[in-house]
Structure formats: C-alpha cells, structure tokens
C-alpha cells in the first residue's frame, strides 16, 4: 500500500553470546529524508503517550549526537535508503525483537527484525545428496545461518576425525535476502568410505572449536570379492584337479547372484561360491574370476591365471619378411604352443640342421641370395620335444646382376648409321620385366632389351642401359664414339679488329667447333679458286682487288664441311678518277656541257672539288659540273678531286673545247 514505508532485510538473524550481528537493511521513506532514528529492543506501543516504550539501543537526532553507551550498536545507514545495523559484541539478552523507529518530516514508521542469540555457538548443518554411489562425485554442503564482518569463522571437514584432503569452497552471504556461511566439498567416495563419519566443524579465526555436525556415509557399491585357488600357484599338468573359492568382503546393498567367468566368458551352470575343475585339459588354461551382483551392479574378483602345462605342439615358422630384399635383415620366429614355454630350439635350412641356432628367433642381418629356401624348427620344454612342422619358404629378391650394354654394330660408328645395342645381365629375382636407356631418345626397341638408334647423331656420346625387375640395375655407360665430318665451320677475321683498310695486313681464320676423327685438312677458296690449305689465310698488304666472297672447307676421313661465304670488304681512298664530258669534249657555245667526276671509292665519295687549268678551285662540290650556256671562254683543261673518309684522289686533266656558233661566225 502506498501509505507504507518499504523495508528489505532478513526476517530473523542468528548469533551467539560474544559474537556479533550484521543486519543488512534497505528502506524507502514515504516523503523526504530521515530526520530521526531510534533502535528499540522489544518495543511496545503506549496508547496513552502514543509513543513506543522499550530499551533504546541506539538513537540519532537532528543534532547528530550519540550517547557513549551506544558504541556497541552502530547505525551504518543513511537518510534515504540504507538502514544497515551492526551489534558487536552481541549478548544473550539481545534476543527478541529489534524495532527500527524511523521519522521523516511528516511520516513515522516502526520496522521489526527478529534476533535469535544462543548461549553457545549453534552447530552447522550438513546436507547430503539423497544417494551416494562409489566413484561418483558428490557435493557435501555445510550450512551455518550466521555471518558477521566483525567475527570471522571457518568451517572444516573431517573424515573419521581426520581433515579431508579435498579442497572445500567456502562462501558467505550478507545480503538483505539472506545471511549465512556455506562450505561445499566435492568428493568421490570409494566403497571403503561406507559407514564412515563425516564432520563439519565450526571454528573461530584461530581454529578454536565452536560447534559441529556429523553424518554417517551410506556408500552404495558393487560386491567386493576375494578369490582363492588350490593349488595356490594355479600351475597344474593335464589330468590334475583345481578348486577355486569366491569370498564376499563387502556389499551394499546385499548381493543377489553368483557366477564364474573364464577369459571374460561366463561358465554355464556354475552359480555357487566354489568352482571345481576335475581332470583339466590344456584348453582349460586361462584367466578365471568370480562375479557377484547386487542392485548397484556386478562386482568381479581379481583374475587367477590357470596354467595347464603340456609338451610343445608341432611348430610353424614365421618369416619377417618374405620375400626379402638382398642386403636387408630377416627374422625367423619358431612358433609352438607349449607350457611352460620352450627352453630350446633346433633350426633347419633346407632340411639341414643350422649349427649354433637354439633360440626362438634367428636373425640374419644381411640376406644374400643363397639364404633362400625352406626353414623349419623343433621346440623343446621340460615336458618333452615337439614335432617339426612343415616349415616356411624364404624368397630372396635382388636386382639384376652384372648388367652390360653391348654394341652390336661393327666399329667405327659414323654419323647417320643405324646402331643396335643390347642390354645383357647375369641373373635376376624376380625376372627382368623391362629395360631403361640413358639418355632418353625417340628410339626404337624392336624387342625386349634391344635398342635401335636410327640415323645416329654426331653428339650421341655414351649410352647406358638398365635391366629392371622391382629395381633397376644400370650398366656402365658405353661410348658410341660416333665419327662425323667437321662441324660449325666459319670464317673469322683475326686482324684487323674492325674495318679492313687498303694496305692492312689481314688474317682470316677457318674455325670449326668439333671433328671426329680430329685429323683435318683446310681449303680456302675465292670465287671457286683454291687459295690455300692452312687454317689461316693471310694477306700481307690487302688491296681493293682482294675484296670478294671467301669460303673455307674443313675435311676429315668422314667428310668435308664448308663455311658460309664470307664477304671481305676493303676501305680505300678514291681512285681511278676521271672527268667525263657530255655530250662530248667539243661543244658549241650557247649549248650546255656536263662534266662528271667518276671514281672508285669505299666508302663512296662524299665530297667533290673541281679545278680549272689554272688549278683554281671552282665553286662546285657535287659530282656533276654543269655549264649552261657554255661560252668559248669555258674552253680549257678541267680536273676533279674526290674525298671520302679514308682520303682524297684526283683525276687527270680533261680538255673541253667550246667552238663558236654559226651565228657568231656570221656576225664576224
């Protein structure tokens, strides 16, 4: 209802003499801030005075003064929402009702809180799950309805009076909803914990005992069993008798059924605590145990290993591994069922006893082809000697042996010949299934192990073959030693380095990259004419007439090879200059005359100079000198000079005659 003040706090708080009480509290006043607060002990309303009577434990007024006796009780709240209280220490006679008298400017309220103070520390309470089963983790809870900031406590767990090893988790609550201290312990009980006493002990900060709670554990578990056997070592010979007894040492709840198992399988019609085995056979060897069940489940005893002893049975040989690769290691294992285990072995290879081999295993570190064959063995123990079994076959595999590449052709081989090679070997296991050849080529294999090289190349130097089964064995390479005519013949200028100038000494070299056989002859030719038979062609002083197309030939006993034609070019100054005249050397005045400076030069003439009969240079620099109209005064001797980058050349004089025209003669 909106006319009420709203308070939140625990309904009742618990403590004991000498401890303390912390009262968490919140409130909301109807209007404004709190102006006055009185804490009463067991307040009663006086109708006459319209006030509350009772012991005043705490009082706060507008001036904020607090009497000195109020130090034990503290109001830790404020004027609008917090009403937390603390009583330290708390006494037995503090039990009862606490009344919080609150006054604001216009409203008043009395809030009641119950306080239960006992004479001595009250015990905590242990809470257990409804059922505890062995090896299933459970949480044990110890709860105490007390917590106070001014009075630290601790909760300790004990099993049969001894502190428990497991770590407990302690939590405290001091809220308006609840005040408590709680300890939780996670614990996996074993069947041996059944009936044991668990204690939760309340202690003060110094570990002094204050109170405790105890419970007895009821741990549900499968039956716990012990097995006994006669004879005690459980070792017998065929035909002996054996007795086994099953005893229950603990079961919760009580057991219901009994059975016996051999090698994990239930024995039929054996439902008593005693198992009698008469005239045992070797098949009865094995691991025995008894099984007893209750509502939790079946419990099993430890296993008893019953050994029925007998002489070795016929043996078999196991080979690790067959087929074996030559050079690898092989282990032979003699397998014979016997009890006790055989103490001595005899080994046979192809029916012949292997000397010095008496162990269960025979190890051959490096297998060779002669190790192949049948291996058998005989086992022996204290009860007798077994029989020799059928044995096992060792197959020793190895790469082809002594592989060779053989040339079938008559020697020598010439470039372009068809060469046939065969790949031979001595022995192989498994059989040779294929052959490989090096280097690879687009070659024919007309039959297995035969290689045919059509049109053999000059550079086919060596060939190797491999015979292959599971592995390939390579033969040493065989040299084909192919003979061929000289290759890559070319003309190379040795001197000069660059352009050949007229007068230079010139050396041309006839080069070739290879020849087989090595012995060669050289031939030089120009325009089909033989010039020399040395590797070099030398010109002491070259002239323009030596220019032209040169070739060299290199031959050996297989054939001859020509170089590409090599053009020899000679640079020279202009020569053979002459002045030609058109239309002729006699021209009528008034007509036109053209003088041309003809020359032979390399590089071509780039600059011409014309001179007259007085050796006066004329202002013309092209190859043609054109006189138009020609005059009689032009008559005379002319010469020209040609210049290229090498030098100059001059022509002899050429005379031009200009005669008068009929008109001129007529005028005279």
């Amino acid at each position: 209802d909106s006319s009420k003040w709203v308070f939140e706090h625990p309904e009742t708080l618990y403590a004991w003499e000498g401890a303390c009480v912390w009262i968490p509290c919140t409130y909301r006043a109807l209007d404004g801030d709190l102006e006055s607060f009185i804490l009463f002990h067991n307040p009663e309303y006086n109708k006459n005075t319209s006030k509350f009577d009772g012991t005043r434990l705490y009082e706060s007024t507008k001036d904020g003064k607090v009497p000195s006796e109020q130090k034990r009780v503290q109001f830790l709240g404020d004027k609008n929402k917090n009403c937390t209280l603390s009583i330290h220490p708390v006494h037995l006679n503090d039990s009862g009702q606490l009344g919080l008298r609150m006054e604001s400017k216009t409203e008043k309220w009395m809030e009641r809180i119950h306080l239960n103070v006992s004479e001595r520390p009250f015990p905590p309470h242990i809470q257990l799950p409804p059922e505890i089963q062995e090896s299933q983790e459970v949480t044990l809870t110890c709860l105490l309805n007390f917590s106070c900031y001014g009075y630290p406590i601790q909760l300790q767990w004990l099993l049969e009076g001894v502190p428990m090893r497991q770590a407990a988790v302690t939590s405290t609550s001091l809220t308006i909803k609840s005040v408590f201290t709680r300890s939780e312990l996670k614990f996996s009980p074993q069947w041996s914990h059944h009936g044991k006493i668990v204690t939760c002990q309340l202690q003060d900060a110094d570990g002094k005992f204050l109170s405790n709670d105890t419970v007895q554990l009821n741990v549900k578990h499968t039956p716990k069993l012990e097995i006994k056997v006669t004879p005690s070592d459980a070792i017998v010979r065929e035909g002996d008798s054996v007795t086994m007894t099953c005893e229950v040492s603990s079961s919760n709840p009580e057991y219901t059924t009994v059975s016996w198992l051999k090698d994990g399988t239930s024995l039929k019609k054996q439902n008593t605590f005693t198992l009698n085995l008469r005239e045992v056979t070797k098949d009865q060897s094995g691991k025995y145990c008894c099984q007893v069940s209750n509502d939790v489940g079946p419990g099993r005893s430890e296993e008893v290993f019953l050994q029925v002893q007998y002489a070795p049975e016929p043996s078999t040989v196991q080979i690790l591994h067959s087929p074996a690769v030559e050079g690898s290691q092989v282990e032979f294992l003699c397998m014979s069922l016997a009890n006790p285990l055989p103490t001595n072995y005899t080994w046979y290879h192809n029916g012949k006893e292997m000397q010095g081999r008496t162990e269960e295993k025979v190890h051959i570190p490096k297998i060779l082809p002669w190790h192949a064959g049948t291996y058998s063995c005989v086992a022996e123990n204290i009860l007798g000697t077994g029989q020799r079994g059928p044995g096992a076959e060792l197959d020793v595999q190895y790469p082809p042996k002594k592989v060779t590449t053989v040339i079938q052709n008559p020697m020598p081989i010439r470039e372009g010949d068809t060469v046939t090679l065969s790949c031979n070997y001595n022995s192989s296991n498994p059989s040779v299934t294929r052959y490989e050849w090096k280097p690879h080529g687009a070659w024919e294999e007309p039959s297995l192990g035969v290689l045919k090289i059509q049109n053999v190349g000059w550079d086919n130097t060596t060939i190797a073959c491999a015979a292959c089964n599971s592995w390939c064995s390579w033969a040493s390479p065989v040299a084909l030693n192919v003979q061929y005519a000289p290759r890559d013949v070319r003309v190379r200028k040795i001197k000069p380095l660059s352009e050949i100038h007229s007068g230079n000494s010139v050396s041309l070299q006839c080069d070739f990259s290879s020849s087989h056989p090595k012995e060669v002859q050289f031939f030089w030719e120009k325009n089909g004419r033989l010039l020399g038979k040395e590797s070099q062609l030398n010109f002491d002083s070259i002239s323009p007439e030596d220019a032209g197309s040169y070739s060299c030939w290199v031959n050996n006993s297989i054939g001859q090879t020509a170089s590409k034609a090599w053009t020899l070019e000679v640079l020279y100054a202009p020569r053979r200059l002459r002045v030609s005249m058109s239309p002729g050397d006699q021209v009528m005045e008034g007509k036109s005359a053209t003088l041309t400076c003809e020359s032979d030069a390399n590089p071509p003439v780039s600059h011409y100079t014309w001179f007259d009969w007085n050796n006066q240079s004329l202002p013309y620099h092209s190859q043609k000198l054109r006189l138009e109209p020609v005059k009689v005064q032009h008559s005379g001797a002319y010469w020209c000079q040609g210049t290229n980058s090498v030098g100059k050349g001059r022509s002899p004089l050429s005379t031009l005659t200009v005669y008068y025209s009929p008109e001129t003669i007529g005028r005279r």
Partner: antibody
C-alpha cells in the same frame, strides 16, 4: 699483342707548338693507318686526322692549317705536330690504329702560360 | 661536317636491365658507324663496327643495329663492368665525327 704509347711535353705555352710521338709495337706501320683523337677534360672525343700505311694523310678541316702528321716506319713511330696552340687545345691526345681498333693510353697536354 | 646526336646524355640502370643508346646522324652515313666504351681514366675500346658487327672477344650481350641516319647500341642484360661512357663514331663521310657520349651509371 698490339700496343701504342704516346709521349708529349705535358705543358706548353699558348702560341707555341706541340709535338707528340706515338710508338707502335705488334704491327707494321707499312700496313696500318694511325689516327689521332683528342679529348678535352670532362668532354667527348674529337677526331683530328690520320696517316695511312702508304704515308697519305687526312686532316680534320678545322685543323688543316695548324696540324701535320708524319711517321718513321723503321722506328714504328708516328708524329703529331700542332702549331699556334690556344688554351682550348688542352686535352688528352690519343693515337689509335686505323679508326680505333687499338688505342694508346693517351698523353695529357695543358696549354697555359 | 656530319653532326652525331647521341641520346640520352646519361642514364641510370639496374643490373640485369636491358639498355639502349641511340645515335642520329645529320645525313645518311650508310651504316659506317662504330661504337666505343670508355671507362674513367682509360682509353676508349671498340665494341662494334659497320653498325652491327661485334668485335671478337666483346660479350654477346652487346649488339648494334640501324641504317641510314638512325643507329642504336643495346646491352641485353646489364652487368657491373658495363658502367662507363659510350660513344658512336661515323666514318661514312669525311671528316670522322663522334657523338657527345652517353654516361651509363648503376641505379
């Protein structure tokens, strides 16, 4: 192998004449031309002239009035003479076979008073 | 005189890079052109003559091409020892003239 070596005065006063000798080994001057090329400091190459195996010469037109090239085949020597020197004739002077097949290491000329 | 215009005047290149230097003649020189390499403090060395003919002993990464007025020198894959100044020389027309040079440096 072919080797060329220039020898010159190093320092010459302006208006004076320059004479440089190029000594050739490894080939005959009867058969080969010798060119002269110069290179001013930090600049490019300039062709000056050539004397051929037969003794004929060819000079750069810009220097024709100041330059003369001669040789002594028996001593395998070629001579360059440059008259009326100016400061811009300062350069390294090289001799070379034909038009640069083989070069001498050069001789440095400084024209300064 | 024939003027030989060489370009670029200088260039920086990385090892392994392809490098091309060009020379342009002011008139047709008929492939009468050679290329020279000069290293600092050394005399020039001939590499190529007649525009495209490689001198014996010069590495094959050097090649020359061109005709008429336009010519070029190419280094297919630059090596450290190729640093220096490169000159072209025309000898087709008197007087012989060199290009101004191309300085090749490592980037």
């Amino acid at each position: 192998q072919v080797q060329l070596k220039e020898s010159g005065p190093g320092l010459v006063a302006p208006s004076q004449s320059l004479s440089i000798t190029c000594t050739v080994s490894g080939l005959s001057l009867n058969n080969y031309g010798v060119s002269w090329v110069r290179q001013p400091p930090g600049k490019g190459l300039e062709w000056l002239g050539v004397i051929w195996g037969d003794g004929s010469t060819n000079y750069h037109s810009a220097l024709i009035s100041r330059l003369s090239i001669s040789k002594d085949n028996s001593k395998s020597q070629v001579f360059l003479k440059l008259n009326s020197l100016h400061t811009d004739d300062t350069a390294t002077y090289y001799c070379a076979i034909n038009w640069g097949d083989y070069w001498g290491q050069g001789t440095t000329l400084i024209v300064s008073s | 005189d024939i003027k030989m215009t060489q370009s670029p005047s200088s260039m920086n290149a990385s090892l392994g890079e392809r490098v091309t230097i060009t020379c342009k003649a002011s008139q047709d020189i008929n492939s009468y052109l050679s290329w020279f390499q000069q290293k600092p403090g050394k005399s020039p060395k001939i590499l190529i003559y007649r525009a495209n003919r490689l001198i014996d002993g010069v590495p094959s990464r050097f090649s020359g091409s061109g005709s008429g007025q336009d010519y070029s020198l190419t280094i297919s894959s630059l090596e450290y020892e190729d640093m220096g100044i490169y000159y072209c020389l025309q000898y087709g027309v008197f007087p012989l003239t060199f290009g101004a040079g191309t300085k090749l440096e490592l980037k």
